[in-house]
Interface confidence: low
């Protein structure tokens, strides 16, 4: 499991706002935000990135294809760029994950999963804003 504590959160936020968010919204276009309830949450920035990484790249029983989508490719590039040593840990993780996944499908859940991802990214941005506000208050 990669430890996201040493990532450059500001740079990741910039990448998210510039491109990843648009790709996620494009993927969800035509789907109302009220269609799905957000059940996945995160409490701090590293935790949010852990959950984002898991939901984006680990095939689940009801959604196996997200990793090849544009937003996933950009997420991977962003994490590789701004999280030291992330790329190296992912090579082994991918191999292990391929071996253990189980994908019996009755109902597709990809849109629900991307809806959860949008929620996690928003939470990541919010925790970042909170940190910046705290930092701002300490200096005044």
């Amino acid at each position: 499991m990669y430890d996201f504590t040493n990532c450059d959160f500001q740079k990741i936020e910039a990448d998210y706002l510039r491109t990843i968010s648009k790709d996620l919204i494009t993927y969800m276009s035509g789907t109302k935000s009220t269609d799905f309830n957000n059940t996945v949450s995160c409490s701090n920035r590293p935790h949010c990135l852990t959950e984002i990484q898991s939901l984006t790249f680990n095939p689940t029983p009801r959604c196996a294809s997200l990793a090849k989508e544009m937003f996933a490719r950009k997420t991977k590039a962003t994490l590789a760029l701004w999280c030291p040593g992330y790329s190296e840990t992912q090579i082994n993780a991918t191999q292990a994950m391929k071996k253990r996944r189980k994908r019996k499908v009755t109902t597709n859940k990809c849109l629900e999963q991307v809806s959860q991802l949008l929620g996690l990214w928003r939470r990541f941005i919010r925790t970042l804003l909170k940190k910046q506000l705290e930092h701002h208050h300490h200096h005044h």
Epitope: M28, G30, D35, R101, K102, T106, N108, C110, L111
Partner: antibody, heavy 117, light 107 residues
Framework: QVQLVQSGAEVKKPGASVKVSCKAS????????MHWVRQAPGQGLEWMGV????????TYNQKFKGRVTMTRDTSTSTVYMELSSLRSEDTAVYYC??????????WGQGTLVTVSS | DIQMTQSPSSLSASVGDRVTITCRPT??????LAWYQQKPGKSPKLLIY???TLAEGVPSRFSGSGSGTDFTLTISSLQPEDFATYYC?????????FGGGTKVEIK
């Protein structure tokens, strides 16, 4: 590049069985499900079932339950679809097609199965 | 099972025309819809999935829209190679089902 190569055309008598093969290449065989879809002459497409090559887990269309069996051989990256108790209305082109989430990005060339007495 | 009603079943059009095909599932499938093109004697070819995502290598004149129970495939400017039969298919859950097809013929 991704290729799904199916076995050749078959002519069968009513009541017999047919086994169609589909050999996959150009990707990791166990990563994608393999579905079977058939098309009767001049008709639309009909989903028959799916096999997960990683563990042979299958889900069949209720319509074909008891008559269809899907298997796989990971050593040759081949999936098989066997249909038993054939009747004339089973005359169709049978396609194997790969998928991750229910939409089909690559298809085999099709295998014509003719059921005739 | 979810039934897919496609219309029209056939249409005649000329090169350069804008063509619209609709697909209506019997229940809400959100955006879990794919479109395929099939030419005589050939296997179907994926055009669009998740209602509007263009498959790799598919020309941008093809576009998909809609969600829930109303979907549309649009060919903005029909080309000679586009004369074929088009099928919609829901990929929401088992059993995956297809529409009856729309044959696009030369006027």
């Amino acid at each position: 590049q991704v290729q799904l190569v199916q076995s050749g055309a078959e002519v069968k008598k009513p009541g017999a069985s047919v086994k169609v093969s589909c050999k996959a290449s150009g990707y990791t065989f166990t990563t994608y499900w393999m579905h079977w879809v058939r098309q009767a002459p001049g008709q639309g497409l009909e989903w028959m079932g799916v096999i997960d090559p990683s563990d042979s887990d299958t889900t069949y269309n209720q319509k074909f339950k008891g008559r269809v069996t899907m298997t796989r051989d990971t050593s040759t990256s081949t999936v098989y679809m066997e249909l038993s108790s054939l009747r004339s209305e089973d005359t169709a082109v049978y396609y194997c097609t790969r998928s991750l989430d229910g939409y089909y990005d690559y298809w085999g060339q099709g295998t014509l199965v003719t059921v005739s007495s | 099972d979810i039934q897919m009603t496609q219309s029209p079943s056939s249409l005649s059009a000329s090169v350069g025309d804008r063509v619209t095909i609709t697909c209506r599932p019997t229940e809400n499938i959100y955006s879990y819809l794919a479109w395929y093109q099939q030419k005589p004697g050939k296997s179907p070819k994926l055009l669009i999935y998740f209602a509007r995502t263009l498959a790799e290598g598919v020309p941008s004149r093809f576009s998909g829209s809609g969600s829930g129970t109303d979907f549309t495939l649009t060919i903005s400017s029909l080309q000679p190679e586009d004369f074929a039969t088009y099928y919609c298919q829901h990929h929401y859950g088992t059993p995956w089902t297809f529409g009856g097809g729309t044959k696009v013929e030369i006027k």
